[in-house]
């Protein structure tokens, strides 16, 4: 469930603190409820960037697990189509710390509406 997704995000946050990854990532910091699945897709795609940049097995495994969890949760809700949402590349670029904080925020939005 989404609580496990948050715990994975916290784990990633802890793991990257010991590394020096200075990537900037497309970040949706003001998610509109009607675009939350699209925003989630962008967050997950950018997480894969973190995994690549880190070259770390623990981060890699945690990112994959997080994607698996999110996929299964969202697929159980059926196909959700959203329109009029921003493309990932249109989002503001932020550092990893801000990115992860915004990610936790969107997950909490899913928790609150489930």
């Amino acid at each position: 469930n989404w609580v496990n997704v948050i715990s994975d995000l916290k784990k990633i946050e802890d793991l990257i603190q010991s590394m020096h990854i200075d990537a900037t990532l497309y970040t949706e910091s003001d998610v509109h409820p009607s675009c939350k699945v699209t925003a989630m897709k962008c967050f997950l795609l950018e997480l894969q960037v973190i995994s690549h940049e880190s070259g770390d097995t623990d981060i890699h495994d945690t990112v994959e697990n997080l994607i698996i969890l999110a996929n299964n949760i969202l697929s159980s809700n059926g196909n959700i189509t959203e329109s009029g949402c921003k493309e990932c590349e249109e989002l503001e670029e932020k550092n990893i710390k801000e990115f992860l904080q915004s990610f936790v925020h969107i997950v909490q939005m899913f928790i609150n509406t489930s």
Epitope: M40, L44, D61, T62, E64, N65, A70, N71
Partner: antibody
Framework: EVRLMASGGGLVQPGGSLRLSCAAS????????MSWVRQAPGKGLEWVAT????????YYPDSVKGRFTISRDNSKNTLYLQMNSLRAEDTAVYYC???????????????WGQGTLVTVSS | DVVMTQSPLSLPVTLGQPASISCRSS???????????LEWYQQRPGQSPRLLIY???NRFSGVPDRFSGSGSGTDFTLKISRVEAEDVGVYYC?????????FGQGTKLEIK
């Protein structure tokens, strides 16, 4: 050439336990997630378990969840499948397979071992 | 769970002729990141399965170019442009977009 050698199969009574092993060579074992897939005699393939590269994350179908445990020892380049509370319907050839990462290549099981037969019967 | 349904279950083909196997999923297997994790595996008689195609249409290394994959959403196809004797065996589609990962029932290709 990637090599995967499954072993540990045999005859076991219903309710019994068995541990399968899969020895990996000719690739960096710790860089790959691994899976077990089984095939009952004369039947199709069924996914049984997957484990992440570091071993922290495991995935199972409901048919084996709570009875089977996948694990790995990266220092020994070996994958395991601990099977408890075995049932007649667990009778199958069990294959180990290397799994390409979602992040680097798209999830496929690119190399398979030769399989080991597990027979559950009284 | 995602159910994968293959057709036909048996496929007699003349050597040198084309062959086509269909695989349909009970729901879309496009994942949240936009990827479709659909593979095709070949199992020759008495052998272990072998990867042919991954992510719908990507041929695995060493797989002859007479094998091709196509499709999207819920409908997928494996095509063999000209069947050879070594192609005899059972072909399985497999989805690993969603846990539990699931195989189709298999299609047995035989020579007429």
């Amino acid at each position: 050439e990637v090599r995967l050698m499954a072993s540990g199969g045999g005859l076991v009574q219903p309710g019994g336990s068995l541990r399968l092993s899969c020895a990996a060579s000719e690739f960096t074992f710790s860089n790959y997630a691994m899976s077990w897939v089984r095939q009952a005699p004369g039947k199709g393939l069924e996914w049984v378990a997957t484990i992440s590269r570091g071993g922290d994350y495991t995935y199972y179908p409901d048919s084996v969840k709570g009875r089977f445990t996948i694990s790995r020892d990266n220092s020994k380049n070996t994958l395991y499948l601990q099977m408890n509370s075995l049932r007649a319907e667990d009778t199958a050839v069990y294959y180990c397979a290397r799994r390409v990462s979602m992040i680097t290549g798209g999830w496929a099981m690119d190399y398979w071992g030769q399989g080991t037969l597990v027979t559950v019967s009284s | 769970d995602v159910v994968m349904t293959q057709s036909p279950l048996s496929l007699p083909v003349t050597l040198g002729q084309p062959a086509s196997i269909s695989c349909r999923s009970s729901q879309s297997i496009v994942d949240i990141t936009g990827n479709t994790y659909l593979e095709w595996y070949q199992q020759r008689p008495g052998q272990s399965p072998r990867l042919l195609i991954y992510k719908v249409f990507n041929r695995f290394s060493g797989v002859p170019d007479r094998f091709s994959g196509s499709g999207s959403g819920t409908d997928f196809t494996l095509k063999i442009s000209r069947v050879e004797a070594e192609d005899v065996g059972v072909y399985y589609c497999f989805q690993d977009s969603f846990v539990p990962y699931t195989f189709g029932q298999g299609t047995k290709l035989e020579i007429k």
